[in-house]
Structures are given as structure tokens and as C-alpha cells.
Amino acid sequence: EEELQVIQPDKSVLVAAGETATLRCTATSLIPVGPIQWFRGAGPGRELIYNQKEGHFPRVTTVSDLTKRNNMDFSIRIGNITPADAGTYYCVKFRKGSPDDVEFKSGAGTELSVRAKPSAPVVSGPAARATPQHTVSFTCESHGFSPRDITLKWFKNGNELSDFQTNVDPVGESVSYSIHSTAKVVLTREDVHSQVICEVAHVTLQGDPLRGTANLSETIRVPPTLEVTQQPVRAENQVNVTCQVRKFYPQRLQLTWLENGNVSRTETASTVTENKDGTYNWMSWLLVNVSAHRDDVKLTCQVEHDGQPAVSKSHDLKVSAHPKEQGSNTAAENTGSNERNIY
């Protein structure tokens, strides 16, 4: 009679994470008598996966009834597969011995590859806000996928970006992989409503890529422009001066009126109007009693936006002139740093 052969008909098996892997194995003879064992890997460090004779292997089930006398099918099923299960599995026939069974013949091995989906991409931007015309970095990370081949793309408002660098780790063989990409994005004054999207395509996703997004509203700071104008007189001795604060984002803004350098009123932007591009406009007014001033008055609208150094604009109110409307004086903007006295 021909010597027993252990046949593993599948050189490789590909299974999606979470599913069940079937590893096929048949023997060509019932002799010699002895159990079958399954191992992952070869050599002294191999890992026992299933022992027909003894042990508890909750994830493993046999395809046929191994207790039947004439059974020669030693195929197994491994449930709830994870990337950690990847490797080469050997079906090994043992000959009954005393005191221990002796390894008789091994199958050629079946390589189990696990297809694992990448995790949802996580996109993160800079630690602090940046102003328009600056280039900032966004990172995208996704983990736990297998096989290693993966495609990552970046988009800003649907337009594909080209300035990015991507790494897949580790470089060598591994049960699963991670991807890390950094894209450079140029901010514009119109980017409050913009989105940066990281798109990951992988064989496990059946053509339906995963996307991670970041809203540029979390990243951008649009500085305001200021305009101080004098309105027509309300009464003989009263002049209305307005400060228009335009095109700013985010909304956090505090405005202070100063008369000849002395604080007159401080207020916080509340009832702002929103522009189409997501930036805000706000207007504050100051009623000045001209008769209370003997000399010309320097009115300053000082704005502190989103914790930045104060920006200001001044208007010279001529007291000597008859109180009629005067043109706006687009004097000073920008007081520099918070620690400085601008007057």
C-alpha cells in the first residue's frame, strides 16, 4: 500500500476579517493510526491551532466527523478571523506512539491572508488658527488594514490636491498596516465654508472609499477690515460715528471706543450679519456730544479679534467746524501688540 500523503489542496486562502476561514486537508490513507494536528508556522516556534486528540479550541470546528473510523478529511474552520490570524497553516499527521505520538507527515501548507478594512480616516489640522494666504498641514490616518496595497487621495472642496506625502507602515510583512499622509493646503479668504477631505480606497471596500473630513472653519482666522465714518448730525450738538467691522472670522470680537485715548465704551460682537462666504460683518456706533469738547476729538474704534493684538482705526472730529457731516478719515489700522500703548 502507498505511503500516506497529507494533501492541502489550497496554496492560499483569502478571508475577510470577521468571517470564517476554511482550511482544507485530506489524508490518502488511514494508516498509520494517529491523530491530526494543525499548526501555524513551521519549526520549533510553531503555534498549535487544533489537536484532534485533546485540548480546547473554541474558534475551531472540524468540517467532518473526525470520530468516524474511515474519516480522511481533516479540514477545519476558524471563526471570527482577524488580521492576527494571517500566516501559513500546516496540517500534520502524527503516528500513535508511546509515551508520545510522533510526527509522521506534514501537508505543504496553506497561506491564510486576511483582508481587513481600514479604519475610518481621521483628519486633523494645525494646532492654532492661520490667516489666509498661508499654507498649513493636514494629516490623515487610517489603521488596521490588510493587504498592504491602499490608495489615499486628498481633496479641497472636491478639487484633488497634489501636494501631499503618504507613508504605509510597516514597510515589511505584517498582519495589518497603517497609513499616514500629510497634505499642504493653502488658505484663502473664502475658505470658511471649505472642507478638506481624505479619501482611502482599499480592496476590502468594494469600490466605496472611506472619507475623513476637516472643516477649514476650525483652522482659518480672517482678520477684519475697519472703517470709521461720521454720520449726518442727529441733533445740533450730537454726532453719530460708526465703526464698520467687515469680513472677519471667527465671530469672537471685542470693540472699544476711545475718545482722545480714553475708553468710552466696550462691547462684544453679538448680532452680527453673516456673509455668503461665512465671514461676519458688524457695526458699532458712538454718539458724541460735541458741545462737551472744546478741542478737536480723536475717535478711535479698537477691535480685538479672536485674541489677536488689537486693530484700530481713528477719525478726527473737528469741533471748531459747524457740526455737519464730514468725510471719513481712514486713518489708523492696527495697534500691533497687546502690550503696547498706541497713543
Epitope: A128, H134, S314, G336
Partner: antibody
Framework: QVQLVQSGAEVKKPGASVKVSCKAS????????IHWVRQAPGQGLEWMGD????????ANNQKFKGRVTMTADTSTSTVYMELSSLRSEDTAVYYC????????????WGQGTLVTVSS | DIQMTQSPSSLSASVGDRVTITCKAS??????VAWYQQKPGKAPKLLIY???SLETGVPSRFSGSGSGTDFTFTISSLQPEDIATYYC?????????FGGGTKVEIK
């Protein structure tokens, strides 16, 4: 008080790179941008670019076609400007300056670093 | 890039004279204009920002005005220590650009 202290003069050969440092003190380093401006002998001022140490955001003058790299080390409050592929026309005094983009002009300047490119 | 055309390139005036320098931008820069003074061998010094704001510690004889594309820098009464080169600069759009400079001398 606000101070920007730059590294010393450099002499480089054409094709080489130079890295100029600018150490900031007297203010919150991550709140302000550091800009780089150069001035060739007897010439005017030319803006090269800036970096915001807080956000890592940068803006560059495209004239330099990627030859300028700016980095910031928040642990030492130092900004570095590296200019590569040097040519003789890069001979200039290089200044680092402080500003708040969109809000404020360049209010404090370093003492300048003379970079001479000569074969 | 926004061009800043500064004129004149040089001027000579007497102590006490009123000196005016103009700067024309190639496009609207709102009021993001600064003026700097540079003395030989020294770094530039900020005098005026936001078109008309006087930097802290700068004498009140220096002033600025204008908006949009046309800007003016004035020294109301020229002093011997004002001998320097003056530059305008826009900081509305990158790349930030400077005027060519005006060298001011005493007659």
C-alpha cells in the same frame, strides 16, 4: 522687551545651502509670525516668506521657487530659514522680523545676517 | 504680485521743510500699508502702519494717509536725524512687497 537675535555672518559657495537662525524673546513666540526679508548690497527690501510657529502655517514668495524652507522650534523660540542652491545674487543681508499677518506690519526686526555667496 | 511704485527715488530738502513721499499700489490694498525708515548699516524701523497709525515712540512729525491704491508719507518738519531711506510696503496680499525706496538728504 521684544528681541530678535540672528546668527552670524556666513560665506558660502554657489550651489550650497545656508541656514540662518532667529531667536525670539520678550513675547509669546507662538502668537506672532516670523517673516524673512532680504536686502542685497545697495538695493531695496525683498520679502521672502513667513512662518507662524503656533499653527505651523507658512507663506512663501514664489520667486524663490521652493529654495526657501522655514522651520520653527517652539522649545527654543527659534525660527530657521534655509536657502538652498545659492547663487551670487543671493548675497544679501537677511533679516527676520515679527508681524501679525493681516493685522499688523513688521514691528520688530533682527540685526540682520550677512550671507556672502562667492566661489 | 502687487507692485508698489514709490516716488521720488531720492530728494534733498532743508531742515524744517515739509517732505512728501508717495506710493502707488498696482491694485487695491485697502489700507494695509506700512512705512519704514532705514539708516545705513541698520535694520529698517517701522514708523507708520495701517496707512496712518504712528508706531509707538515715533515722533509726530511723521504721518501717513491714503487708501485703496494711493498712499502718502509726510515729514512735516525735516530734522537732521531724519536722513535715511524710506520704504513703503503692502501687507494685504502675499508676497508682501516694498516700494523701491526714497533716499532723503539734507540740502
Amino acid at each position: 522687551q521684544v528681541q530678535l537675535v540672528q546668527s552670524g555672518a556666513e560665506v558660502k559657495k554657489p550651489g550650497a545651502s545656508v541656514k540662518v537662525s532667529c531667536k525670539a524673546s520678550g513675547y509669546t513666540f507662538t502668537d506672532y509670525e516670523i517673516h524673512w526679508v532680504r536686502q542685497a548690497p545697495g538695493q531695496g527690501l525683498e520679502w521672502m516668506g513667513d512662518i507662524h510657529p503656533g499653527s505651523g502655517g507658512t507663506a512663501n514668495n514664489q520667486k524663490f521657487k521652493g529654495r526657501v524652507t522655514m522651520t520653527a522650534d517652539t522649545s527654543t523660540s527659534t525660527v530657521y530659514m534655509e536657502l538652498s542652491s545659492l547663487r551670487s545674487e543671493d548675497t544679501a543681508v537677511y533679516y527676520c522680523t515679527r508681524a501679525v499677518s493681516g493685522y499688523y506690519a513688521m514691528d520688530y526686526w533682527g540685526q540682520g545676517t550677512l550671507v556672502t555667496v562667492s566661489s | 504680485d502687487i507692485q508698489m511704485t514709490q516716488s521720488p527715488s531720492s530728494l534733498s530738502a532743508s531742515v524744517g521743510d515739509r517732505v512728501t513721499i508717495t506710493c502707488k499700489a498696482s491694485e487695491d490694498i485697502y489700507d494695509r500699508v506700512a512705512w519704514y525708515q532705514q539708516k545705513p548699516g541698520k535694520a529698517p524701523k517701522l514708523l507708520i502702519y495701517g496707512t496712518a497709525s504712528l508706531e509707538t515712540g515715533v515722533p509726530s512729525r511723521f504721518s501717513g494717509s491714503g487708501s485703496g491704491t494711493d498712499f502718502t508719507f509726510t515729514i512735516s518738519s525735516l530734522q537732521p536725524e531724519d536722513i535715511a531711506t524710506y520704504y513703503c510696503q503692502q501687507y494685504w496680499t502675499t508676497p508682501w512687497t516694498f516700494g523701491g525706496g526714497t533716499k532723503v538728504e539734507i540740502k
